[in-house]
């Protein structure tokens, strides 16, 4: 039975330019974790192997950070990050548990003027 | 380059062990590539068997899990296949192959030649 | 286990056409897919990874394309040197696995 949970930060936004931490954790369950997947629609940004580490997808090397922990760092983002992103924790013997968060990215002046998401 | 070789014995009696050597020239064993086992049955279907990677963790196919173990030996840049209680079933070439897990995910990119196994009595 | 689907086990072609292998993830891979190419009595060799990424060395006529569950592996402009068995694999999660296989026959 799947007894965990995945916390995400929700709803979050960034500058153009910047860069953004995407973190989840996944809480409420003894199961061990094999590897942690980060994919924006059907696109792979990184993998976290617990074995064999980080996998870095070549359409994302420029601009993807591995870290902290099993977060991944996205940077000099632009409009097109815009978007969901899905944190998918490979477990043992639980399975698979899915957290989302969505980004916007803003131009730098509206995001100055404090048009933020708040993070539940 | 990475070159990686096979040896073993080519036959196997059912219900023994298969092991298998994969020796590797051109790279160390410790460096951060992963080191696979990967086997082709008659009729070409391939199989993943496992891992082990350059920490010495492995990891194996759960449909092999409670038959195979992958080690190394780090001062003869060697890793190793055992399969226990073997049927006609194994029988197949095994390959050992390697990979930049960074750079190419699960993708192979260095294999061995290749060794033939046949199970028989 | 995820299961890779190569609908096709023989294609035929002739030397410069085009040509295009499928593969179909059994559940979303992502662009976790790796194709490869193993001519008769050699091992399997890599020529995609990334489902989209040629590896070093691989000429630029092979290209492969696709994510999710759905991904096409082409050649093209066949060559005859070109004649050999094609796999798909995922990397996904662990099993890794491969598809059937796809075997190009030059007419």
């Known amino acids: 039975m799947m007894t965990g949970t995945i916390e995400t930060t929700g709803n979050i936004s960034a500058e153009k330019g910047g860069s953004i931490i995407l973190q989840c954790h996944l809480s409420s369950t003894t199961a061990q974790v094999t590897q942690v997947n980060w994919e924006q629609q059907d696109q792979l940004l990184a993998i976290c192997n617990a074995d064999l580490g980080w996998h870095i997808s070549p359409s994302f090397k420029d601009r993807v950070a591995p870290g902290p922990g099993l977060g991944l760092t996205l940077q000099s983002l632009t409009v097109n990050d815009t978007g969901e992103y899905f944190c998918i924790y490979h477990t043992y013997p639980d399975g698979t548990y899915t957290g989302r968060i969505f980004l916007e990215v803003l131009e730098s002046s509206v995001a100055e003027h404090g048009a933020r998401f708040q993070i539940p | 380059d990475v070159q990686l070789q096979e040896s073993g014995p080519g036959l196997v009696k059912p219900s023994q062990s298969l092991s298998l050597t994969c020796t590797v020239t051109g790279y160390s064993i410790t460096s951060d590539y992963a080191w696979n086992w990967i086997r082709q049955f008659p009729g070409n279907k391939l199989e993943w068997m496992g891992y082990?990677?350059?920490?010495?963790?492995?990891s194996y196919n759960p449909s092999l899990k409670s038959r195979i173990s992958i080690t190394r030996d780090t001062s003869k840049n060697q890793f190793f296949l055992q399969l226990n209680s073997v049927t006609t079933e194994d029988t197949a070439t095994y390959y050992c192959a390697t990979l930049i897990y960074y750079d190419y995910g699960g993708a192979m990119n260095f294999w061995g030649q290749g060794t033939s196994v046949t199970v028989s009595s | 286990d995820i299961v890779m689907t190569q609908s096709h086990k023989f294609m035929s072609t002739s030397v410069g056409d085009r040509v295009s292998i499928t593969c179909k993830a059994s559940?979303?891979?992502?662009?976790?897919v790796a194709w490869y190419q193993q001519k008769p009595g050699q091992s399997p060799k890599l020529l995609i990874y990334?489902?989209?990424y040629r590896y070093t060395g691989v000429p630029d006529r092979f290209t492969g394309s696709g994510s999710g569950t759905d991904f096409t592996f082409t050649i093209s402009s066949v060559q005859s040197e070109d004649l050999a068995v094609y796999y798909c694999q995922h990397y996904y999660s662990t099993p890794w696995t491969f598809g059937g296989g796809t075997k190009l026959e030059i007419k």
């Open positions: 559940q979303g891979v992502s662009t976790t």
């Open positions: 990334s489902a989209s």
């Open positions: 082990i990677s350059n920490s010495g963790s492995a």
